[in-house]
């Protein structure tokens, strides 16, 4: 599965868990393997392209999640979701444009 599809599906599920179920722990459990995949690095040209387009925002979002886990400060979580939302919108637009 392509990275943009995995992230699109992952962010859908993360938004269900956070905004639907109010399950922050579940949300992190969905996002953690996706961030781990990014940390392992791109293996193909498409993954390299994805990493260049979204890698920085997703890394920053992960940092805000880690801050939240330490601090419990909801503002850290909103910063993370600002970035996830930005990435989600861009993936959705790009994906829609090419299909």
């Amino acid at each position: 599965i392509l990275w943009h599809e995995m992230w699109h599906e992952g962010l859908e599920e993360a938004s269900r868990l956070y905004f639907g179920e109010r399950n922050v722990k579940g949300m992190f459990e969905v996002l953690e393997p996706l961030h781990a995949m990014m940390e392992r690095g791109p293996q193909t040209l498409k993954e390299t392209s994805f990493n260049q387009a979204y890698g920085r925002d997703l890394m920053e979002a992960q940092e805000w999640c880690r801050k939240y886990m330490k601090s419990g400060n909801v503002k850290d979580l909103t910063q993370a979701w600002d970035l996830y939302y930005h990435v989600f919108r861009r993936i959705s637009k790009h994906h829609h444009h090419h299909h």
Epitope: G20, V74, Q79, W81, D82
Partner: antibody
Framework: EVQLVESGGGLVQPGGSLRLSCAAS????????IHWVRQAPGKGLEWVAS????????SYADSVKGRFTISADTSKNTAYLQMNSLRAEDTAVYYC????????????????WGQGTLVTVSS | DIQMTQSPSSLSASVGDRVTITCRAS??????VAWYQQKPGKAPKLLIY???SLYSGVPSRFSGSRSGTDFTLTISSLQPEDFATYYC?????????FGQGTKVEIK
């Protein structure tokens, strides 16, 4: 076509009980989120309660906690609001609304609402 | 609880006017804000979700924007059918909360 139809409203005395129903059609009810929102006469909107049809997880406003119970019957595609120990301040039009969580679906927001059912608590 | 402070509570405007309604969240809510239109005796209708996304079927004269915890609904050119009450609403945390409403009346 998505439809939500409330029923069960009416006149009840303080301390009495009432059960509201919200019949849903036109979407996958078993994986949806249904909320109740009320509006007192001439006032604004107030969120009351929510339920996840799949997990049955629920949330309540402090003003109704311990008195109201939200539930869902996926075999009947219907959500319920059981209202006990009713007070004059519970007088309102009660709306059920579908809540969508996902950015791609048009959320997080209430995308479809029922027509509302009036609950009047008075002696 | 997160307070959504909406202003103004009412306004008078003419057809063709540009109308702006604002909502300030008492704490950060990311972009989890929606706007609704309600007419007397009717259920609210979704206009804007995720602060700035136009809901399907809503005329393009409606738009939403965000600056931090300040959210704005703009009607670029008011039409006769737009005279109604408008509400903002946050979904970031439970309890979900609404603004007090803005009644848009004919001048």
């Amino acid at each position: 076509e998505v439809q939500l139809v409330e029923s069960g409203g009416g006149l009840v005395q303080p301390g009495g009980s009432l059960r509201l129903s919200c019949a849903a059609s036109g979407f996958n009810f078993s994986s949806s989120y249904i909320h109740w929102v009320r509006q007192a006469p001439g006032k604004g909107l107030e969120w009351v309660a929510s339920i996840s049809s799949s997990s049955s997880s629920t949330s309540y406003a402090d003003s109704v906690k311990g008195r109201f119970t939200i539930s869902a019957d996926t075999s009947k595609n219907t959500a319920y609001l059981q209202m006990n120990s009713l007070r004059a301040e519970d007088t309102a039009v009660y709306y059920c609304a579908r809540y969508v969580y996902s950015y791609s679906q048009g959320g997080p927001a209430f995308d479809y609402w029922g027509q509302g059912t009036l609950v009047t608590v008075s002696s | 609880d997160i307070q959504m402070t909406q202003s103004p509570s009412s306004l008078s405007a003419s057809v063709g006017d540009r109308v702006t309604i604002t909502c300030r969240a008492s704490q950060s809510v990311s972009s989890a804000v929606a706007w609704y239109q309600q007419k007397p005796g009717k259920a609210p209708k979704l206009l804007i979700y995720s602060a700035s996304s136009l809901y399907s079927g809503v005329p393009s004269r409606f738009s939403g924007s965000r600056s931090g915890t300040d959210f704005t609904l703009t009607i670029s050119s008011l039409q006769p059918e737009d005279f109604a009450t408008y509400y903002c609403q946050q979904s970031w945390s439970v309890p979900i909360t609404f603004g007090q409403g803005t009644k848009v009346e004919i001048k």
